[in-house]
Interface confidence: low
């Protein structure tokens, strides 16, 4: 038997017996040039909802370094450089997969983990709650 | 690379060819509630740099479904609803880890792959090149 795939030869993760442990080759195939996000673009500085990038490091995780965005302002920056508090800077979050060492400190054994990271910020119109 | 601690209860991995292949438990530990990004927030609609979410599906990849953001406008939406082309809507991109089946169709064997995905859009001041 085999854990049944959704496509010839591929497991279906919706079934409870999707193989719990698989072999993963850590020779990363990179479909794009990996760069420090600070160097990849200067959007974090030029945005109307600018953000700072904070380094989050965890040796028990792969990748061990993740950059987290923190919006600089509650409001959004106007053309004149002042902050408009009628608008809101909000983080854009994404769920990403990381590998977590399990048991701890073991180099060859990992568990897949989903974590929520803030990638950058965007400027949104606030939701106004009208009081009756 | 991965920081490799010494621990007597773990396989030896001190040699130069730190195991290219590791065991990964696919019982995902979720540190947050997994949701369809369209439901997680309505920022994509309320942003001054709104975006659409496109479903990217690949059965040879885990996760097989990834949502890609595409900015709706070249410019940014003003308070009056018109687009300001003196500003630019740009995608915020992030490198994420995915598992790629290798060899293809094999249920138990994967390679780690980095791919660049657009998570959302932000409004930036354009870089103006002054012509002498």
């Amino acid at each position: 038997g085999i854990a049944i795939p959704r496509n010839s030869g591929c497991p279906n993760s919706e079934d409870k017996n999707f193989p719990r442990t698989v072999m993963v080759n850590l020779n990363i195939h990179n479909r794009n040039t990996s760069t420090n996000p600070k160097r990849s673009s200067d959007y974090y500085n030029r945005s109307t909802s600018p953000w700072n990038l904070h380094r989050n490091e965890d040796p028990e995780r792969y990748p061990s370094v993740i950059w987290e965005a923190k919006c600089r302002h509650l409001g959004c920056v106007k053309a004149d450089g002042n902050v408009d508090y009628h608008m809101n800077s909000v983080p854009i979050q994404q769920e990403i997969l990381v590998l977590r060492r399990e048991p701890r400190h073991c180099p060859n054994s990992f568990r897949l983990e989903k974590i929520l990271v803030s990638v950058g910020c965007t400027c949104v119109t606030p939701i106004v709650h009208h009081v009756a | 690379g991965i920081a490799i601690p010494r621990n007597s209860g773990c396989p030896n991995s001190e040699d130069k060819n730190f195991p290219r292949t590791v065991m990964v438990n696919l019982n995902i530990h979720n540190r947050n509630t997994s949701t369809n990004p369209k439901r997680s927030s309505d920022y994509y609609n309320r942003s001054t740099s709104p975006w659409n979410l496109h479903r990217n599906e690949d059965p040879e990849r885990y996760p097989s479904v990834i949502w890609e953001a595409k900015c709706r406008h070249l410019g940014c939406v003003k308070a009056d609803g018109n687009v300001d082309y003196h500003m630019n809507s740009v995608p915020i991109q992030q490198e994420i880890l995915v598992l790629r089946r290798e060899p293809r169709h094999c249920p138990n064997s994967f390679r780690l792959e980095k791919i660049l995905v657009s998570v959302g859009c932000t409004c930036v001041t354009p870089i103006v090149h002054h012509v002498a």
Epitope: G1, I2, P5, R6, G9, E14, K16, N17 | N108
Partner: antibody
Framework: EVQLVESGGGLVHPGGSLRLSCAAS????????MDWVRQAPGKGLEWVSS????????YSADSVKGRFTISRDNARNSLYLQMNSLRDEDTAVYYC????????????WGQGTLVTVSS | DIQMTQSPSSLSASVGDRVTITCRAS??????LAWYQQKPEKAPKSLIY???SLQSGVPSRFSGSGSGTDFTLTISSLQPEDFATYYC?????????FGGGTKVEIK
């Protein structure tokens, strides 16, 4: 105790149909993928078809594609194999088998039911 | 499709003998191989999974080894109840395929 009991086998003419059933007990049927495997008289084992826990994913050997349909009823703890357009070469003992929880082959098999296709 | 070739197709051995059966895959299947034992008129019984892991309840005289394309089932000291036919099966990818079987007979 895990038990898989097949039924529905018998003699059928070429071109005819038959429906095999497999009654499961002693485990949470809905948590396991299930398969059918057959064995022609005096021959080796041949995989026939697989079905996922939710019935969303189904695989069949090329030799039976378009003729045999695997299905399951989790409420009834039952696995089925609908066999149409039967041929002489389909004559075999048909086993229902449980896929191990982690997908490592078949950990339990039924006793089998004999299907004979002959004119 | 992945072809599984077992050898020998049959062998004669005595109680107490060490018996080795080999199975070769036409392409690499990592460690995704199972071994089954089948006695006449009976259903197959699972012995080994993941090439070398012993199914619970199976005597320790049975062992499996190998990865990639070449695999071995070893019975360290053949017992009277071990006379049967043995099959290997790959579950690396669909379609699932079995070896042709090895019949272990009494010498």
């Amino acid at each position: 105790e895990v038990q898989l009991v097949e039924s529905g086998g018998g003699l059928v003419h070429p071109g005819g149909s038959l429906r095999l059933s497999c009654a499961a007990s002693g485990f949470t049927f809905s948590s396991f993928n299930m398969d059918w495997v057959r064995q022609a008289p005096g021959k080796g084992l041949e995989w026939v078809s697989s079905i996922s826990t939710t019935s969303r994913i189904i695989y069949s050997a090329d030799s039976v594609k378009g003729r045999f349909t695997i299905s399951r009823d989790n409420a009834r703890n039952s696995l089925y194999l609908q066999m149409n357009s039967l041929r002489d070469e389909d004559t075999a003992v048909y086993y229902c088998a449980r896929v191990s929880y982690y997908g490592h082959g078949f950990d339990y098999w039924g006793q089998g039911t004999l299907v004979t296709v002959s004119s | 499709d992945i072809q599984m070739t077992q050898s020998p197709s049959s062998l004669s051995a005595s109680v107490g003998d060490r018996v080795t059966i080999t199975c070769r895959a036409s392409q690499g299947i990592s460690s995704w191989l199972a071994w089954y034992q089948q006695k006449p008129e009976k259903a197959p019984k699972s012995l080994i999974y993941a090439a070398s892991s012993l199914q619970s309840g199976v005597p320790s005289r049975f062992s499996g080894s190998g990865s990639g394309t070449d695999f071995t089932l070893t019975i360290s000291s053949l017992q009277p109840e071990d006379f049967a036919t043995y099959y290997c099966q790959q579950y690396n990818s669909y379609p699932l395929t079995f070896g042709g079987g090895t019949k272990v007979e009494i010498k």
